[in-house]
């Protein structure tokens, strides 16, 4: 955030840019957390904005049968093995085809025994507060499937009348892993050592990382006509005066009439 | 890429004999699978032998056993079908396939490459 200086008062403003502000020339350049001329106020929401999907991965490892282990299986790019990652692929994406989340295999190894196939099925989901129970859940189905169609699908006196065959014992799954994502923790970390007065509220299922001085929120401060501020010991109420009243309270809600006041004072004298 | 082209089709009476070749390009390797598929009309395309050009593997059918030969010749790179003592059920569309692994599959979603079909009618 920055605030342009125009004037005499500019090299004067210059060295007292606050909070790790730079001076370029024209104003001071704040640091994520300010703004301000002199980067002297804190910001009331920062952007924690979180990703637009959530991955996971998971490492399985099947058995195939159908195929017999030849040596240039094991070499990435030679015609024997682009041929078995196109038909492995083509049949995970008929076993896995009912899983919205699903996005594709990986295969890391192929090695001996029958043909060993370790590799990663590869899982997607929309950002949704609930996205671990969404991922959880979609890798409870992997296994499922994979289960079922590694002991439907096996060789009867030594053939295969599927696409491809397994050994129902081979299928084993090794690791799941989700990417994490943590908006309280971002919001706590970006809020530095304003950490502790920083909160997530959601709106349309979006995280929102806002101090109390942020309007429009359940845990907004209500200031009244006065100015809310972050300092580092919490959220406070700058009250303001006008050219009738003077403000007061925590929330700036008591106002005193300055004529009052002035004539009780008149009058005491 | 992996080239097929299969010729020998033909008309013949029941009883009688046809020999179908497959000319085959394109790989990289001396050993991997090849087969013959069949398509009726009305039906499903379905194998009818498959062998491994190394020697190590050939499978046939229960309904061609005895009467149909798979062969290849890797000097030539080509696929043969003999077919003997043909039968009127012997007729159909004949497509030969490969495949650059050791397959032991006879569905054809398994087989990437494909030869366009040769006729085969037996009358009786």
């Known amino acids: 955030r920055t605030t342009t200086c125009f004037g005499d008062g500019c090299q004067n403003t210059a060295s007292r840019c606050k909070n790790g502000g730079t001076w370029d020339g024209l104003k001071c350049q704040c640091p994520n957390l300010y703004y301000g001329e002199l980067c002297e106020e804190v910001v009331s929401s920062i952007d924690i904005g979180p990703p637009e999907t959530i991955s996971a991965q998971m490492e399985l490892t099947v058995t195939v049968t159908s195929v017999k282990f030849t040596e240039e299986l094991k070499n990435h790019s030679s015609q024997e093995f682009q041929e078995f990652k196109q038909t492995f692929t083509e049949q995970m994406n008929i076993v896995y085809s009912g899983i919205p989340e699903y996005v594709g295999v990986n295969i890391t190894k192929l090695r001996l025994g029958s043909v060993v196939v370790e590799h990663d099925v590869l899982l997607r989901t929309k950002y949704t507060p609930e996205y671990k129970t969404v991922l959880d859940n979609a890798t409870e189905v992997v296994k499922e499937k994979i289960t079922k169609v590694t002991t439907q699908q096996i060789m009867i006196n030594d053939i295969c009348s599927d696409m491809m065959c397994f050994n129902t014992t081979g299928t084993q799954v090794q690791n799941i892993t989700v990417t994490q994502y943590d908006p309280e923790e971002d919001c706590r970390k970006m809020a530095k050592e304003y950490g502790d007065y920083f909160v997530v509220e959601y709106r349309d299922q979006k995280p929102y990382c806002i101090s109390p001085c942020e309007p429009g929120f359940s845990v907004s401060k209500n200031c009244n006509l006065g100015k809310c501020q972050m300092s580092l010991s919490g959220p406070q109420c700058l009250c303001v005066t006008t050219e009738t009243h003077w403000y007061s309270g925590e929330t700036c809600n008591q106002g005193t009439q300055k004529s009052l006041v002035y004539g009780h004072h008149h009058h005491h004298h | 890429d992996v080239q097929l082209q299969a010729s020998g089709g033909g008309s013949v009476q029941a009883g009688g004999s046809l020999r179908l070749s497959c000319a085959a390009s394109?790989?990289?390797?001396?050993?991997?699978?090849m087969a013959w598929f069949r398509q009726a009309p009305g039906k499903e395309r379905e194998v009818v032998a498959f062998?491994?050009?190394?020697?190590?593997?050939?499978y046939y059918a229960d309904s061609v056993k005895g009467r149909l030969t798979i062969s290849h010749d890797n000097a030539k790179n080509t696929l043969y079908l003999q077919m003997d003592s043909l039968k009127p059920e012997d007729t159909a569309m004949y497509y030969c396939?490969?495949?650059?692994?050791?397959?032991?599959?006879?569905?054809?979603?398994?087989?990437?490459?494909w030869g366009q079909g040769t006729q085969v009618t037996v009358s009786s």
């Open positions: 396939a490969a495949s650059s692994l050791l397959l032991q599959t006879i569905n054809p979603r398994a087989w990437p490459y």
């Open positions: 062998i491994w050009t190394d020697g190590g593997r050939t």
């Open positions: 394109g790989y990289t390797s001396n050993r991997y699978s």
